[in-house]
């Protein structure tokens, strides 16, 4: 007797009978920028304060008939999904609604900007606890809307938005494309991406995670006790806003970066059928469905990391792609990927006082992606050690020589166009795990970090025969920080982290032939923080 | 997610500040840019968000908006300042003819201008 969507986001230990997490979210205020709402609906009565903010365009069409229940439909449903008494995620959360969408569900970028400004001013006038802003809307890519979201996020506000219902790359829409915003795609009861008529949920690297978004039962503005099913990425975003409210209520000091990492960490992994997405988007789209944490406390001891993909570099010879971590995150490793296999590797470099991950395209290549591994590592001091190309046949190597620094990632970058095509593989000397090894014609970059209690180890998985994909995973209690391929395998397309697994992709084996170059080795660097574990135990 | 120089239509109007003898001409070498929605049906021409450089104060935003109105009036154009932004981004929202974009891009403190566009419930 519990709606499927609430069951789906609820960890098994909560599911004894009903949806029974505590009435969470009571310390959090959720702002909803949407249509008008029916605030006296039983689901949300007394929980939603309708602000006097309204900035909407006129409805299209001369014969448009403004019917209150239709005007309120979208916003009322979403308010119910976030905090409804019976069908809401965060039943204790209080909400404030701003009207930025008209009775046809249409608004403007400028109206949304003024709404975001209103929230910021309200926050300054009357600071409260944690704020979550739900933006269940989308327009074309907008530099100014993304910039406003960035400013609000940097003021400590958590913004959650719909990925969009256009069955398209979410990076082409705003605010979905704003890096500081938590962007949510929609899945159904079968954990499949939601189809909406001829379209469906957006996808791609700008999506952070998915959440239930089809046949979601929620408050209907038709009557004060009515319910209705609605579908869309707005409904999915509302689930994540509710989960965020629950998490922030349990841990009000969480930063946006910490919250995002936890949302990713507690999500159900690898349950979405990726065949629904266009082939070129599958690797970029996170296979994550949002869920509540199994308990409201005690996640602090883990080392949290996520994978951030850059935009595509484009095909020009000197094209590069840059992946960046959020301000509160540390870049612990950098890798690259090219579908054609023509790339010149990647390097970590400083930009504006922060490390970024830059990948380099090669002549004749169709373009590259840079892939950053972004982690939460308090009191970390990280630096990059570089070894230029070596003359010796043993290849290039670099290690972390500073006392107390450990290796978290390896990158290699080369100037020659086709590195290693006719050269034998370079093997890592045994017993030297704290160093990066690369081709003699490549520069090798080691990410070396010092943080209290940080320990890391290298894990390899090699396959002698050619294979399109080789993986190596970190075991329970360890977090993947670095992912790379052992040099010498010319047909490697690149390496990237998926959750706690390092994936090395190779060209189609049918074109490679099974020479000695068929051998592919995936190298994972797995880390954990004893300091975080101890701090967590002391809290408990 | 998307970089600021992202995948959308950008019209860069590189303009010399030669007319009007601006007292506070843009710093040498910086060019204000114009952006509009890549999806044509979603565009709302005639309304523009003028975004000013990061450290611009409210008083400067208001002064820049008034200057735009004055210069537009001298050319026979009516403009209406719909909102002055402060708190998140410095700037203002203006209803004006697209013919005035070149003029607006030359104003002091202007970082970029974006044509308004539609957003939709999802």
């Amino acid at each position: 007797s519990i709606p499927w969507n609430l069951e789906r986001i609820t960890p098994p230990r909560y599911r004894a009978d009903e949806y029974q997490p505590p009435d969470g979210g009571s310390l959090v205020e959720v702002y909803l920028l949407d249509t008008s709402i029916q605030s006296d609906h039983r689901e949300i009565e007394g929980r939603v304060m309708v602000t006097d903010f309204e900035n909407v365009p006129e409805e299209d069409g001369t014969r448009f008939h403004r019917q209150a229940s239709k005007c309120d439909s979208h916003g009322t449903h979403l308010a119910g999904v976030v905090s409804g008494r019976d069908a809401g995620v965060a039943k204790g959360a209080s909400m404030r609604s701003l009207r930025v969408l008209n009775c046809q569900g249409k608004g403007t970028v400028s109206g949304t900007l003024i709404g975001l400004e209103f929230i910021r001013k309200s926050q300054l006038v009357q600071p409260v606890g944690p704020l979550v802003v739900l933006l269940p809307l989308a327009g074309g890519y907008s530099r100014v809307l993304n910039a406003a979201c960035q400013r609000l996020a940097r003021a400590g506000v958590v913004l959650v938005t719909a990925a969009g219902n256009f069955r398209d790359d979410a990076c082409l829409y705003s605010p979905a494309s704003a890096p500081e915003v938590i962007t949510v795609g929609a899945t159904n009861a079968q954990d499949q991406p939601v189809t909406l008529g001829t379209l469906g949920t957006n996808f791609g690297r700008c999506v952070d995670l998915f959440a239930p978004g089809e046949d979601i039962i929620g408050a209907s503005s038709d009557c004060s006790t009515c319910f209705v099913s609605q579908s869309g990425t707005s409904q999915a975003a509302a689930h994540v806003a509710g989960i965020a409210a629950m998490m922030l209520s349990a841990e009000p000091e969480l930063t946006l970066a910490e919250l995002r990492q936890r949302l990713i960490h507690f999500s159900a992994k690898d349950v979405i059928n990726e065949a629904w997405f266009p082939e070129d988007q599958r690797v970029l789209t996170p296979n994550l469905v949002a869920a509540l944490p199994p308990s409201t406390h005690g996640a602090g001891w883990q080392l949290f990391c996520r994978t951030v993909w850059s935009a595509h570099s484009g095909p020009t010879r000197m094209a590069t792609a840059v992946a960046r971590c959020a301000p509160d995150e540390e870049l612990l490793s950098c890798s690259s990927f090219s579908r054609s296999g023509k790339r010149r590797g990647e390097r970590m470099e400083a930009q504006g006082g922060k490390l970024v991950c830059r990948a380099h395209n090669a002549f004749g290549g169709e373009g590259v992606y840079a892939i950053a591994r972004c982690c939460l590592l308090p009191q970390a001091n990280c630096s990059v050690h570089t070894a230029p190309p070596a003359e010796a046949s043993m290849g290039t190597r670099v290690h972390c020589h500073q006392q107390g620094h450990v290796l978290t990632g390896c990158s290699s970058h080369w100037e020659v166009e086709d590195l290693g095509t006719h050269k034998p593989p370079v093997l890592r000397p045994r017993g030297q795990p704290n160093q990066c090894v690369g081709h003699r014609e490549a520069s090798i970059h080691a990410s070396c970090c010092h943080a209290p209690g940080l320990e890391c180890k290298v894990k390899e998985h090699g396959i002698p025969a050619p294979q399109e994909q080789v993986t190596v995973a970190c075991e329970e209690g360890w977090t993947l920080t670095g992912c790379s391929a052992l040099p010498g395998t010319s047909h490697v397309l690149g390496a990237y982290a998926v959750d706690n697994t390092c994936v090395v992709r190779s060209r189609d084996v049918s074109t490679t032939g099974s020479t000695s170059e068929g051998a592919v080795t995936a190298v994972a660097i797995c880390c954990r923080s004893r300091h975080l574990a101890q701090a967590s135990q002391e809290l408990q | 997610q998307e970089d600021e120089d992202g995948d959308y239509e950008e019209l860069v109007l590189a303009l010399r500040s030669e007319e009007d003898g601006l007292a506070e001409a843009p710093e040498h070498g910086t060019t204000a840019t114009f952006h509009r929605c890549a999806k044509d049906p979603w565009r709302l021409p005639g309304t523009y968000v003028v975004v000013l450089k990061e450290e611009t104060h409210l008083s400067q935003s208001e002064r820049t908006a008034r200057r735009l109105q004055a210069q537009a009036a001298r050319r026979g154009y009516l403009t209406k300042i719909l909102h002055v932004f402060h708190g998140l981004l410095p700037g203002f929202l203006v209803k004006m003819s697209g013919d005035l974009l070149e003029l607006a891009l030359k104003l002091p403190h202007v970082d970029y201008i974006e044509e308004d566009s539609s957003v939709f419930a999802q």
């Epitope: 007797s1 519990i2 709606p3 009978d17 009903e18 949806y19 009435d23 006296d40 039983r42 229940s69 008494r85 019976d86 069908a87 039943k91 039962i217 038709d222 009557c223 004060s224 006790t225 009515c226 319910f227 | -």
Partner: antibody
Amino acid sequence: QLQLQESGPGLVKPSETLSLTCTVSGGSIGSSSYYWAWIRQPPGKGLEWIGSINYRGSTYYNPSLKSRVTISVDTSKNQFSLKLSSVTAADTAVYYCARENSGVVPAAGPNWFDPWGQGTLVTVSS
Amino acid sequence: EIVLTQSPATLSLSPGERATLSCRASQSVSSYLAWYQQKPGQAPRLLIYDASNRATGIPARFSGSGSGTDFTLTISSLEPEDFAVYYCQQRRNWFTFGGGTKVEIK
């Protein structure tokens, strides 16, 4: 089948608090599919909804009575209760408890008051 | 608040006759209207919900119609046990009841 039974004092003094309990049998009060309501009927007059509660203790009240009403639930006893403060003679009525489908689970039945208890008369008099 | 006005206040009919009861809302309640039957000393019983749906166990002689502001309860052929008071109730905006129509034996 589900049955509801009201209980409580039949006489309450003006300005005091009226307290009634409804005991549910033949089904569990602890289901997310239902709300549990109080409705009253002054002698010879029509019906007036007072307020409702769900198994989590989430309430909503008739706006005209909200300031004086408290409804609570005890799932362990399969009971829910009504308290109406500062009563006057105008509060003299037959008080009914009833089940109301929450509407969240459409299969649970129509979203109306059904079934009802047989009612209990409460007189406010000194 | 939505006010429901029932008419007539009393309807005097004989068994076997057709009874038509009216309920008018002060504003649209869409189809969110129910009809209840109450006999002396008993609790009300749900007859019709969502304007036209018969509740479980209700005989086919009871039917409901209407939407918006005007609703009708029809008893096609009155049985002796049908003489009672009938109330309409809306849930478009909270819950309000009509003043009732008494169907009495002529």
